[in-house]
C-alpha cells in the first residue's frame, strides 16, 4: 500500500493523470477494504462528473467526496454539494463550471463516513479529462464536380479541439477515417456521383489546450448523393 497522506498544501507531484493514496491502518478491519476508484470527466467545461462504482462496496455505503486544488488559491477543502445516486446510494458528485479549474491539479478524496480512516485520495489533471459535446450542424458543399467539403460546428472553443471524420459509401464494408486539426473542415477530393456517402465527425480536447484521450460522441450523420441502389446489402445497416 502507498501510505502517503495528501494535504491540500502538500508538495507531492506526479505526471500521471491520477495518483491514488490510501490511509494506513493498524489492524485488519473494514478500514483495509480498498475504496472504489473515482473517475472524473469534464463535459465541455460546463460541468464535471466524478463517479465511482458504489456496488463494489460489501454493503450499501453512502461514501462522501471532498476535493481541493493542490498548491493553488483554491486549496481549501470543499465538500461535494451535489451528489449523484445509484439506487439511493451515493455514486458520484457533480461540480459546476465555477468549481472547475482546468489547469490546476484537482485532488479528490473519497471517504467512508462510518470509518473515517478509510479514505482514498487521487490527483487528477482535468485538462486531460475534458470530453466535448458532439459536433453539430454538419453541412456539405460541392466545391467542384467531384469535390465535397464538409463543415461542422462545436459548442466550444474550436482551436482547442481536434477532430476525426469518418465517411463511407453504401457499398463500403467499413468507414474511412481522416484526422482533422482545429480548422474543423474536411475535403473529399474525389466523389463518385453514383454512390451515396455518409459522413460523421467526433472531436477531442487535444493537443493545444489539453491532452485528453476521450473523444466526444459521434455527430449525427449527414448524407450526400444517389440513393437508388436498392439491392445494396449495407444500406440498411448504415441507417440503423
Amino acid at each position: 500500500l502507498n501510505t502517503t497522506i495528501l494535504t491540500p498544501n502538500g508538495n507531492e507531484d506526479t505526471t500521471a493523470d491520477f495518483f491514488l493514496t490510501t490511509m494506513p491502518t493498524d489492524s485488519l478491519s473494514v478500514s483495509t477494504l480498498p475504496l472504489p476508484e473515482v473517475q472524473c470527466f469534464v463535459f465541455n467545461v460546463e460541468y464535471m462528473n466524478c463517479t465511482w462504482n458504489s456496488s463494489s462496496e460489501p454493503q450499501p455505503t453512502n461514501l462522501t467526496l471532498h476535493y481541493w486544488y493542490k498548491n493553488s488559491d483554491n486549496d481549501k477543502v470543499q465538500k461535494c454539494s451535489h451528489y449523484l445516486f445509484s439506487e439511493e446510494i451515493t455514486s458520484g458528485c457533480q461540480l459546476q463550471k465555477k468549481e472547475i479549474h482546468l489547469y490546476q491539479t484537482f485532488v479528490v478524496q473519497l471517504q467512508d463516513p462510518r470509518e473515517p480512516r478509510r479514505q482514498a485520495t487521487q490527483m487528477l489533471k482535468l485538462q486531460n479529462l475534458v470530453i466535448p459535446w458532439a459536433p453539430e450542424n454538419l453541412t456539405l458543399h460541392k466545391l467542384s464536380e467531384s469535390q465535397l467539403e464538409l463543415n461542422w460546428n462545436n459548442r466550444f472553443l474550436n482551436h482547442c479541439l481536434e477532430h476525426l471524420v469518418q465517411y463511407r459509401t453504401d457499398w463500403d464494408h467499413s468507414w474511412t477515417e481522416q484526422s482533422v486539426d482545429y480548422r474543423h473542415k474536411f475535403s473529399l477530393p474525389s466523389v463518385d456521383g453514383q454512390k451515396r456517402y455518409t459522413f460523421r465527425v467526433r472531436s477531442r480536447f487535444n493537443p493545444l489546450c489539453g491532452s485528453a484521450q476521450h473523444w466526444s460522441e459521434w455527430s449525427h450523420p449527414i448524407h450526400w448523393g444517389s440513393n437508388t441502389s436498392k439491392e445494396n446489402p449495407f444500406l440498411f445497416a448504415l441507417e440503423a
Epitope: V45, Y69, S72, D73, H101, Y103, Q127, C209
Partner: nanobody
Framework: QVQLQESGGGSVQAGGSLRLSCVAS????????MGWFRQAPGKEREGVAA??????YYADSVKGRFTISQDNAKNTLYLQMNSLKPEDTAMYYC??????????????????????WGQGTQVTVSS
C-alpha cells in the same frame, strides 16, 4: 512548430534594470495568454507576469517594478525589469498558451495552462 527564444538576461547590481525579450515563431499573438516565469535553484517555477486579451497580470513580488508588453509586428514579448533585487535571481522563461489567461478557471500562473516554453535566460542580481 511553435518556438520561443528568450534573450536579454545577464548580471546586474541590485537596483539595476534589464529588459528580457521573447521572440515567438509559429505562434500568433492574440487573446491567448503569454507569460514570464522564473525558477531559482532549488525552488519551484513561479509566475512573474502574463499578458493576454488586453490585460496584464503580475505576481505581487514584482508589481510596480516589472512591466510586461508585446510588439505584435515583431511577434515579441518583453519583460522590463527595474529596481532589481537579489531575490529576483533566477532562470527566466517565456511561455505561450492557447487559452486566455483566466479561461477555464484558475489563475494566469497555472503552469499547465502553457503549452510552449522557451529554453530560458539567466538573470543574476548581486548586492
Amino acid at each position: 512548430q511553435v518556438q520561443l527564444q528568450e534573450s536579454g538576461g545577464g548580471s546586474v547590481q541590485a537596483g539595476g534594470s534589464l529588459r528580457l525579450s521573447c521572440v515567438a515563431s509559429g505562434y500568433t499573438f492574440s487573446s491567448y495568454c503569454m507569460g514570464w516565469f522564473r525558477q531559482a535553484p532549488g525552488k519551484e517555477r513561479e509566475g512573474v507576469a502574463a499578458l493576454g486579451g488586453g490585460s496584464t497580470y503580475y505576481a505581487d513580488s514584482v508589481k510596480g517594478r516589472f512591466t510586461i508588453s508585446q510588439d505584435n509586428a515583431k511577434n515579441t514579448l518583453y519583460l522590463q525589469m527595474n529596481s532589481l533585487k537579489p531575490e529576483d535571481t533566477a532562470m527566466y522563461y517565456c511561455a505561450a498558451a492557447w487559452v486566455a489567461c483566466l479561461e477555464f478557471g484558475g489563475s494566469w500562473y497555472d503552469l499547465a495552462r502553457y503549452k510552449h516554453w522557451g529554453q530560458g535566460t539567466q538573470v543574476t542580481v548581486s548586492s
